[in-house]
Amino acid sequence: AGYVFRDKVMSEFNNNFRQQMENYPKNNHTASILDRMQADFKCCGAANYTDWEKIPSMSKNRVPDSCCINVTVGCGINFNEKAIHKEGCVEKIGGWLRKNV
């Protein structure tokens, strides 16, 4: 039962994270939550950084600055892969949740 619950939590978190991405950066509250998660957990996107390509409000050569290894204003514009966190947040935060929840 614990595993089923955990999988359900992960699935919900994945869906919720992707939903929040769709609202980025239009919704300031959403943006600050996502930015905080990406910066704190050193991750980018849901599965990985390429998820940001699919967000209509984001230019295809851009990720949020919070994805950068060294966060500075504009660092996500025309990004180079070596300068950003490539791992997805669902797996990264999910691992933390599994250990701590």
């Epitope: 230019s59 295809k60 892969e81």
Partner: antibody, heavy 119, light 108 residues
């Protein structure tokens, strides 16, 4: 020294195929995005395609979409452009170009290889 | 797509002249603007990146300025080797990477 050397250009009939190669040396290939940029005779510069460090991200100009395929072999420090269904308007010098991205410009260009599409 | 428009298309000048080439973007590109020089039969060469930063090895007579939509490339005192074609290019929003149509600088 830092170098990009293109090869594979030549004369091809309309509808034909060609594969361009670019050998990189003198730098860490995986640190860079790579581009193909072309220049038709007497014309300006036209971006064709780019590929990310890992090869996860690739994009094409509308004029070549569905006909050209960009790829890279990081172990061989090589960039490729597979061109098919070639048209007369694809006739150009094709340059392999290194791109550090961010706010830096495209800082290293190959010497170019000429592709001529004619019957 | 962001369009880049250069002016003039061609320009005649003499050695020692001060020359300015302009580039206009169809929307704001912040400072994500680069300038290249191309001589006949040769590959382009990066001169200026980020609108105003001089690429290593480029003579200091070359300078760039501007941000947003309007940019300029200035050659303070033309040398014989500066006669070439110059292109601007934006990297703010890609794909596509877009270039200006070029400015041909000729000897008067």
């Amino acid at each position: 020294q830092v170098q990009l050397v293109e090869s594979g250009g030549g004369l091809v009939k309309p509808g034909g195929s060609l594969r361009l190669s670019c050998a990189a040396s003198g730098f860490i290939f995986t640190d860079y995005f790579m581009n193909w940029i072309r220049q038709a005779p007497g014309k300006g510069l036209e971006w064709v395609s780019y590929i990310s460090n890992s090869g996860n991200i690739l994009y094409y100009a509308d004029s070549v979409k569905g006909r050209f395929t960009i790829s890279r072999d990081n172990a061989k420090a090589s960039l490729y452009l597979q061109m098919s269904s070639l048209k007369a308007e694809d006739t150009a010098v094709y340059y392999c170009v290194r791109d550090p991205r961010m706010f830096y410009g495209m800082d290293v260009w190959g010497q170019g290889t000429t592709v001529t599409v004619s019957s | 797509d962001i369009q880049m428009t250069q002016s003039p298309s061609s320009l005649s000048a003499s050695v020692g002249d001060r020359v300015t080439i302009t580039c206009r973007a169809s929307q704001s590109i912040s400072s994500y603007l680069n300038w290249y020089q191309q001589k006949p039969g040769k590959a382009p060469k990066l001169l200026i990146y980020a609108a105003s930063s001089l690429q290593s090895g480029v003579p200091s007579r070359f300078s760039g300025s501007g941000s947003g939509t309007d940019f300029t490339l200035t050659i303070s005192s033309l040398q014989p080797e500066d006669f070439a074609t110059y292109y601007c290019q934006q990297s703010y929003s890609t794909p596509p990477i877009t270039f200006g149509q070029g400015t041909r600088l000729e000897i008067k």
